[in-house]
Interface confidence: low
């Protein structure tokens, strides 16, 4: 029988900058029942506080509701593990809510094949931001990424959509059924999970010549350009 091993706070996430949750991994239990407590203080303060809510985030978590969440303030927190033989402490973790936002997936993904008579056909994709994100406040810039692939294909084709909530794609295989998903991230923060998927059947007459595969911004009303590998690499993951 030993004191507990050192715990580790391994993740903190916020869906919208208004609340956040942190999770820790217990160390070894020392063969005895172990109690965990998370304490924190805000940078510039000396007063220590205990975690306000150990329930909402599930096991080994601390949830900070609206009244406990301050933007632009760094939280300094640690976890204390205690059993009958003694205690151990995690390393201190510094958390700024601005940088831990992981939004919910975008909503209302809709995909349509558009075949205007006077223009080349294209796939039109649109979606809405996640409900919990209030873009009107100006606190958020959400960036979007689309992935699509033929149903049977292994590799995803990925497009970075910037701040747009709609997107047009021209170069697709006629007659194929495509799977489309979208995700989002704040300018500082983490990518959301991918949205629920939508399938779309590309008609067999969805054709274009090689010249048409070059998409100019002017051609599509400034809404889209195909991005380079360099752009894709730069935007791809936090």
């Amino acid at each position: 029988q030993l004191p507990p091993g050192k715990p580790e706070i391994f993740k903190c996430r916020s869906p919208n900058k208004e609340t956040f949750t942190c999770w820790w991994r217990p160390g070894t239990d020392g063969g005895l029942p172990t109690n965990y407590s998370l304490t924190y203080h805000r940078e510039g303060e000396t007063l220590m506080h205990e975690c306000p809510d150990y329930i909402t985030g599930g096991p080994n978590s601390c949830h900070f509701g609206k009244q406990y969440t301050s933007m632009w303030r760094t939280y300094i927190m640690m976890v204390n593990a205690t059993n009958q033989m003694g205690s151990s402490f995690s390393d201190e973790l510094y958390v700024d809510v601005t940088y831990i936002v992981q939004p919910d997936p975008p909503l209302e993904l809709a995909v349509e094949v558009k075949q205007p008579e006077d223009r080349k056909p294209y796939l039109w994709i649109k979606w809405s931001p996640p409900t919990l994100i209030d873009l009107k406040t100006g606190w958020f810039t959400l960036l979007y990424e689309i992935r699509l692939k033929p149903e049977k294909a292994a590799e995803w084709e990925i497009h970075f959509a910037g701040q747009q909530t709609e997107f047009k794609i021209l170069s697709l295989h006629p007659g194929q059924k495509y799977l489309v998903q979208v995700r989002c991230k704040p300018d500082h923060g983490y990518w959301s999970a991918w949205s629920p998927a939508t399938f779309i059947q590309i008609p067999s007459d969805f054709t274009m010549n090689d010249e048409q595969k070059l998409i100019s911004e002017e051609d599509l009303g400034g809404e889209q350009k195909l991005i380079s590998e360099e752009d894709l690499h730069h935007h791809h993951h936090h």
Partner: antibody, heavy 122, light 107 residues
């Protein structure tokens, strides 16, 4: 409270076009993440999803019926309309509209209308 | 499109029995699986969403589990009002599809 009510003809002749209206209350068709689905159920058979429309006007249709279906909404009238062309006796069914609820990681039909039985017969 | 296969198509059980209904998707649907109950002449009623989340007002004897392709609806102790048809429905990808239904009858 949330309610949905289907209305439309109870009898349609083969080859005619069916137009069904779903009138909603207790929520707005412009609320983010809200939508309305149409589902039908032939007598004694299983449920079949037909189409849905979201607050951002995103639409989706059943693969097998896509060429015959059109869904639209009038937010101010709180109505969603489904039209189905070239009706056939096999389209005889109870037609339901239901509210789509979009949760953090979930999409589900949480409120349903009572349904309207449409019979296709000459 | 994703196919949803429910089994059994019907079952007979007694009040107090534990009842299990399974639903299999033709491809992975994560946890985007909903369960509905329907009584004769009535509209379906949502029981569970996202595979295991109980809809508000639904008795706790109903539970759901599974992710990926295989899902289960369990009624821990069947009550007289539970005799009905049950449908699974995927909302992972459009077009959405329902299972063919399971009718729970009195033995």
């Amino acid at each position: 409270q949330v309610t949905l009510k289907e209305s439309g003809p109870v009898l349609v002749k083969p080859t005619q076009t069916l137009s069904l209206t779903c009138t909603v209350s207790g929520f707005s068709l412009s609320d983010a993440g809200m939508g309305v689905s149409w589902i039908r159920q032939p007598p004694g058979k299983a449920l079949e999803w037909l189409a849905h429309i979201f607050s951002n006007d995103g639409k989706s249709y059943s693969t097998s019926l896509k060429s015959r279906l059109t869904i639209s909404k009038d937010t101010s009238k709180r109505q969603v309309v489904l039209t189905m062309t070239n009706m056939d006796p096999v389209d005889t069914a109870t037609y339901y509209c239901a509210r789509i609820r979009t949760g953090t990681y979930s999409l589900y039909l949480d409120y349903w209308g009572q349904g309207t039985l449409v019979t296709v017969s000459s | 499109d994703i196919q949803m296969t429910q089994s059994p198509s019907s079952l007979s059980a007694s009040v107090g029995d534990r009842v299990t209904i399974t639903c299999r998707a033709s491809q992975s649907i994560n946890s985007y699986l909903n369960w509905y109950q329907q009584k004769p002449g009535k509209a379906p009623k949502l029981l569970l969403y996202f595979a295991s989340s109980l809809q508000s007002g639904v008795p706790s004897r109903f539970s759901g589990s599974g992710s990926g392709t295989d899902f289960t609806l369990t009624i821990s102790s069947l009550q007289p009002e539970d005799f009905a048809s049950y449908y699974c429905q995927e909302s992972y990808s459009t077009p959405w599809t329902f299972g063919q239904g399971t009718k729970v009858e009195i033995k």
